[in-house]
């Protein structure tokens, strides 16, 4: 998902950006704050047992446009949101898991309310 301050071709920021990191803190982070030349992100995905896991941190400029594009991966429920508009902007990102597709289930049809 695209957020404020982004464009399709990422341009280098003139200054470093600080992001909250959780489950994804690099060695050079301090007090769960990482720094980057790219984007802050928050991601939600299912672990092996089907439980939702939220991860947040920094994405370097290199390759981050592709990573922030959130292209669907078959058989993987995952959603990522990226931002650059202010330091720790990813504190306010709340991606949600995409809905389950019927074919992901083997135990009968789903009934929506």
């Amino acid at each position: 998902k695209k957020e404020d301050g982004e464009s399709t071709a990422p341009t280098p920021r003139p200054k470093i950006l600080r992001c909250k990191c959780h489950h994804h803190c690099p060695e050079d982070s301090v007090n769960n704050i990482c720094s980057t030349d790219g984007y802050c992100f928050t991601m939600i995905e299912e672990d092996d047992s089907g439980m939702p896991v939220v991860t947040s941190g920094c994405l370097g400029l290199e390759g981050s446009d592709f990573q922030c594009r959130d292209t669907p991966i078959p058989h993987q429920r995952r959603s990522i949101e990226c931002c650059t508009e202010r330091n720790e902007c990813n504190k306010d990102l709340h991606p949600t898991l995409p809905p389950l597709k019927n074919r992901d289930f083997v135990d009968g049809p789903i009934h929506h309310k």
Epitope: P14, K15, I16, R18, P26, E27, D28, S29, V30, C34, S35, T36, D37, G38, C58, G60, L61, E62, R86, N87, E88
Partner: antibody, heavy 116, light 112 residues
């Protein structure tokens, strides 16, 4: 051209506070962090902390937490550092410096003397 | 904190000589983005520091090409190919990979 203007000197009494200023010109103030660095004779350079004028987000050297408070006034493109409970150990030259991914421009420094 | 160790502390040279200053860090300065934030500054007597080299080997605008920087990881070098009188002063290395950012103790370049 980029300029960071700081007062040349300040003399203050022990136990008081002081607010040092740094007026930026020649660039968009909110596009860069502002750092503050302390230099005492024979003690090298010490990073105090930095502030992002675009959102007033601050990062401090743990050593200076409680001693230094960084603020900005974006309307006048001025950064400030308040130093509290001053002692002779705070006597030094204090520099402001523009920071993106590295410091590229420094102010001329303010010489702070703490003396009764 | 990352300790930056500069050698030598004092470097007496003759004008026209080559000068070499070493800077070692207590941890790798390779940032998680892949950049190495190691920089060199010159401080002349009574002045504020001036940027010479940023990110290991990039000369800042207006810096003569007799200044060059090299190195990687924890080991870095500043070279001045032919020392001129205006080069005299104290040289500092600095890292902005790890918070708190830290500086070397300085190398004083002086006339022999």
């Amino acid at each position: 051209q980029v300029q960071l203007q700081q007062p040349g000197a300040d003399l203050v009494k022990p136990g008081t506070s002081v607010k040092l200023s740094c007026k930026a010109s020649g660039y968009t103030f909110t596009s860069y962090w502002m750092q503050w660095v302390k230099q005492r004779p024979g003690q090298g350079l010490e990073w105090i902390g930095e502030i992002d004028p675009s959102d007033t987000y601050t990062m401090y050297n743990q050593k200076f937490k409680g001693k230094a408070t960084l603020t900005v006034d974006t309307s006048s493109s001025t950064a400030y550092m308040q130093l509290s409970s001053l002692t002779s150990e705070d006597s030094a030259v204090y520099y402001c410096a523009r920071f993106g991914y590295y410091v590229d421009y420094w102010g001329q420094g303010t010489t702070l003397t703490v003396s009764s | 904190d990352v300790v930056m160790t500069q050698t030598p502390l004092s470097l007496p040279v003759s004008l026209g000589d080559q000068a070499s200053i070493s800077c070692r860090s207590s941890q790798s300065l390779v940032h998680s983005t892949g950049n190495t934030y190691l920089h060199w500054y010159l401080q002349k007597a009574g002045q504020s520091p001036k940027l010479l080299i940023y990110k290991v080997s990039n000369r800042f605008s207006g810096v003569p090409d007799r200044f060059s920087g090299s190195g990687s990881g924890t080991d870095f070098t500043l070279k001045i190919s032919r020392v001129e009188a205006e080069d005299l002063g104290v040289y500092f290395c600095s890292q902005s990979t790890h918070v708190p950012f830290t500086f070397g103790s300085g190398t004083k370049l002086e006339i022999k």
